[in-house]
């Protein structure tokens, strides 16, 4: 009997998938509802707990009881503040366990309490069991995919989750990079490309620029929001349609959590609507106080409404390029994953940002995932299908890895972007005549001083005989593995005595919204990124006008105050330069300036004209922060010239 | 009927300055933007800029940035370029433009000669 | 920075026949939202200044003789003089106004 097949999860925040490699294809395997998707909820009742999408169906109907998101919970503790901002939006409860957050529901009559681990395995299960119900035996190897930005705590707390489901997890990998694989896989042209993968999904945005060369896969770099998706354009919805049913009916259901449960699964099903065609109608029967709710929304007010949503996918496009040192000109292909990037108005900022590329839509979004993590459970496996057999993965540190050497300083062994699995060692020395031994703190960040960046363990290395300063050699070695798990050890040259540590899941890793946020502090002490962030600025600044002059000659208390041809000049030259704006979002500071004051001189004489006595509105400042204080512990350690 | 009137020619000697005016007339000074464009002898035309003449802000090419300068007096419905440092690569005749959809008004352009 | 690059550097046109003249851009100067190419062309008389004849790669100025004509779009573009006329005699020359400002070489049409 032929070896039982690994399969590849794509574990989503919103949605998950399942595939397999066999007879030298994938297959993405349909659930029992005839879905090649399947919901990320689990839902307990007085009777029972449903997974997928059974869970999702009766949300509206149990609420408190049914839950999503895990994802966004997985691998933190209770009091991060993605924690604390995202228990604000969901109807269920997550309580604090020891700084670590748990899900409260009423199950079969009792409060149960699980960790997000626990949620999670549930819908690995059933991802499981969709494979088995497939392919007819048990499974237990799989591959699982995370966010790119996922850190340790994420990982080793999602490896956990497959372990509690029963799986064998073969490796995390992450989600671009798996789709970078299945993209791999449709290729057969030689030479090196370049391609960017666009990975707007449910819950979570990623944006990553791999090198494909005959079958070998090299993560450039990776950037992205974990808070951005699917699930922001629905809110987006259902806030305009909260108050256009406070407009016509003068109620306000937002506090009803049942009417707007039923009015985002509406919102949800127009928003898919709206990616084929150009107007999607509602219909809701009884949504609040026994008034039926018909109505419509454009495809235009929709990408009004999520406008800024939409350009800010461009940020990090922007971000991957620079990390990445090329410049849009040398992508070779743009790969759409996500069932977001089926939206029409993602797709033509992607599409206008590179200059009207084509973008590659082969790959169904919603499995690419699931797709390339199937692959990779196939090589793992041992698979020796032509397909296979030659494609190597090389994934990427998000940021850099190093230690405190003498003054506070950051020395870095392992620079952020640098492909992984990787190896690096250095000799240090002692920094005081008959130093005993020596403390290794463990930092990643990318700030000149320890003291900025983030602590990740430390340990000792102790015994070292007594001798001059500098004369000890101290080799010290920083191994990432594959999974991302970090080994760093300490060995005392002359005596061979050596001391390690593994960075896990307990060291309190940082999050994404904490990474970038040590990314762009770095960058802002670097003077050529100073350059950046003026351009960003005064993109700021331009766009910022033209939606604020835009809406306030659109303001129908301005109807008889402002002539016809004056709106239309001022709505023509807005036009122009959000469409431009859309187009140039790379575009170079002198560029937004121009445009902007362009655009003030259509506008202000106009503007003024209306508030006589008050100055023509202009955009607003930018704050800046200055370096963070604090100060540094002795020096224990010295980098060797 | 508009009207952009620009100052009389000018020869000056190297590392000196030069103001050049451009009044303009018939139309709301404030409603519309003023482009400044040089033209060296028997050469084609180079935009150097502009100024937004309701803010005050102006906007400089990448060649001249550094010793232009662009400022108006809107009291006078007046705009000026002023040009400091004058090498001999600075002679040229320098127009000013209003500017609204394109550069549909000009003045009758300056000679500024350098010449040691 | 768009460049502007007009072929021929000068031309020699009959009375009465056509002249055209080529603007090739650097990038593409077409805005998706208004779909109007950002690109005008002005005439500059001997010892005179510069004229304004078309923007928006097809749009007349006013006053301006139908003869003129301008057409294109995204990065090539043409000025066309249906029935050149001895005042017609001048550089031509075309700008861009897609991002910042930047005039082509100028083209010089003389009769033959």
């Known amino acids: 009997m032929a070896k039982a097949a690994a399969i590849g999860i794509d574990l989503g925040t919103t949605y998950s998938c399942v595939g397999v490699f066999q007879h030298g294809k994938v297959e993405i395997i349909a659930n029992d509802q005839g879905n090649r998707t399947t919901p990320s909820y689990v839902a307990f009742t007085d009777t029972e707990r449903l997974i997928g999408d059974a869970a999702k169906n009766q949300v509206a109907l149990n609420p408190q009881n049914t839950v999503f998101d895990a994802k966004r919970l997985i691998g933190r503790k209770f009091g991060d503040p993605v924690v604390q901002s995202d228990m604000k939006h969901w109807p269920f409860q997550v309580i604090n366990d020891g700084d670590k957050p748990k899900v409260q529901v009423s199950y079969k009559g009792e409060t149960k309490a699980f960790y997000p681990e626990e949620i999670s395995s549930m819908v690995l299960t059933k991802m499981k069991e969709i494979a088995e119900a497939y392919l007819g035996y048990p499974v237990t190897n799989a591959v699982i995919t995370v966010p790119a930005y996922f850190n340790d705590s994420q990982r080793q707390a999602t490896k956990d989750a497959g372990v509690i489901a029963g799986l064998n997890v073969l490796r995390i990998i992450n989600e671009p990079t798996a789709a970078a694989i299945a993209y791999g896989l449709d290729r057969t042209g030689k030479g090196e490309r370049n391609v960017l993968i666009f990975d707007l999904g449910g819950g979570t945005f990623d944006v990553s620029i791999l090198t494909i060369d005959d079958g070998i896969f090299e993560v450039k770099a990776t950037a992205g929001d974990t808070h951005l998706g699917g699930e922001d354009f629905d809110n987006r919805l259902v806030n305009h349609f909260v108050e256009e049913f406070k407009r016509k009916h003068k109620k306000d259901i937002s506090q009803n959590k049942r009417a707007v449960r039923r009015l985002r699964t509406a919102c949800e099903r127009a928003k898919r609507t709206l990616s084929s065609s150009t107007q999607a109608s509602l219909e809701i029967d009884s949504l609040f106080e026994g008034i039926d709710f018909y109505t419509s929304i454009t495809r235009a007010r929709f990408e009004e409404l999520c406008s800024d949503l939409f350009r800010s996918t461009l940020e990090p496009v922007e971000k991957a390029l620079r990390d990445a040192k090329l410049d849009k000109a040398q992508i070779h292909d743009l790969v759409l994953v996500g069932g977001s990037t089926r939206i029409p108005k993602v797709q033509k900022l992607l599409q206008d940002f590179f200059n009207g590329r084509d973008l590659n839509k082969s790959i169904n979004p919603d499995e690419a995932v699931a797709y390339g993590a199937a692959v990779q459970a196939a090589i793992l496996m041992g698979d020796k299908s032509e397909n296979v057999q030659d494609l190597l993965l090389l994934d990427v540190a998000p940021l850099s890895l190093g230690l405190e050497t003498a003054g506070g300083v950051m020395t870095a062994l392992i620079k952020r972007n640098s492909t992984i699995p990787t190896k690096q060692t250095q000799i240090f020395t002692t920094y005081s005549d008959n130093q005993p031994g020596v403390l290794i703190q463990v930092y990643e960040g990318e700030r000149a001083m320890t003291k900025d960046n983030n602590l990740l363990g430390r340990f000792e290395l102790s015994g070292i005989p007594p001798a001059p300063r500098g004369v000890p050699q101290i080799e010290v070695t920083f191994d990432i593995d594959a999974n991302g798990i970090l080994n760093v050890t300490a060995t005392d040259k002359s005596t061979g005595k050596a001391n390690k540590i593994t960075i896990t899941n307990d060291k309190g890793r940082l999050s994404k919204e904490e990474i970038e946020r040590m990314v762009q502090e770095a960058e802002k002490y670097k003077a050529e990124d100073e350059v950046q962030r003026e351009r960003v600025s005064a993109k700021n600044a331009l766009e910022s006008y033209a939606f604020n002059m835009k809406s306030a000659v659109e303001d129908e208390g301005l109807k008889g105050k402002i002539s016809e041809a004056d709106k239309k000049k001022v709505l023509d030259k807005c036009q122009e330069v959000i469409s431009w704006l859309d187009a140039n979002t790379l575009a170079e500071k002198d560029e937004f300036e121009h445009k902007r004051k362009e655009l003030e001189q259509v506008c202000n004489p106009i503007i003024s004209g209306l508030y006589q006595g008050a100055g023509g509105p202009g955009p607003g400042g930018f704050g800046a922060q200055g370096p963070k204080g604090g100060s540094g512990s002795g020096p224990t350690i010295e980098e060797v010239d | 009927q508009i009207q952009l009137v620009q100052s009389g020619a000018e020869v000056k000697k190297p590392g000196a300055s030069v103001k050049v005016s451009c009044k303009a007339s018939g139309y709301t000074f404030t409603n519309y933007g003023m482009n400044w464009v040089r033209q060296a002898p028997g050469q084609g035309l180079e935009w150097m800029g502009w100024i937004n003449t309701y803010t005050g802000e102006p906007t400089y090419a990448d060649d001249f940035k550094g010793r232009f300068t662009f400022t108006t007096d809107t009291s006078t419905s007046t705009a000026y370029m002023d040009l400091r440092s004058l090498r001999s690569d600075d002679t040229a005749v320098y127009f000013c433009?209003?500017?609204?959809?394109?550069?549909?008004?000009w003045g009758q352009g300056t000679l500024v000669t350098v010449s040691s | 920075e768009i460049v502007l690059t007009q072929s021929p550097d000068s031309l020699s046109v009959s009375l009465g026949e056509r002249a055209t003249i080529n603007c090739k851009s650097s990038?593409?100067?077409?805005?998706?939202?208004?779909?109007?190419?950002?690109l005008a062309w002005y005439q500059q008389k001997a010892g005179q200044s510069p004229n304004l004849l078309i923007y928006?790669?097809?749009t007349r100025e006013s006053g301006v003789p139908d003869r003129f004509s301008g057409s294109g779009s995204g990065t090539d573009f043409t000025l066309s003089i249906d029935s050149l006329q001895a005042e017609d005699v001048a550089v031509y020359y075309c700008?861009?106004?897609?991002?910042?400002?930047?005039f082509g070489g100028g083209t010089k049409v003389e009769i033959k």
């Open positions: 433009a209003r500017y609204d959809h394109a550069m549909d008004y």
């Open positions: 990038q593409s100067l077409l805005n998706s939202g208004t779909r109007k190419n950002y």
């Open positions: 928006w790669t097809s």
């Open positions: 700008k861009q106004s897609y991002t910042l400002y930047t």
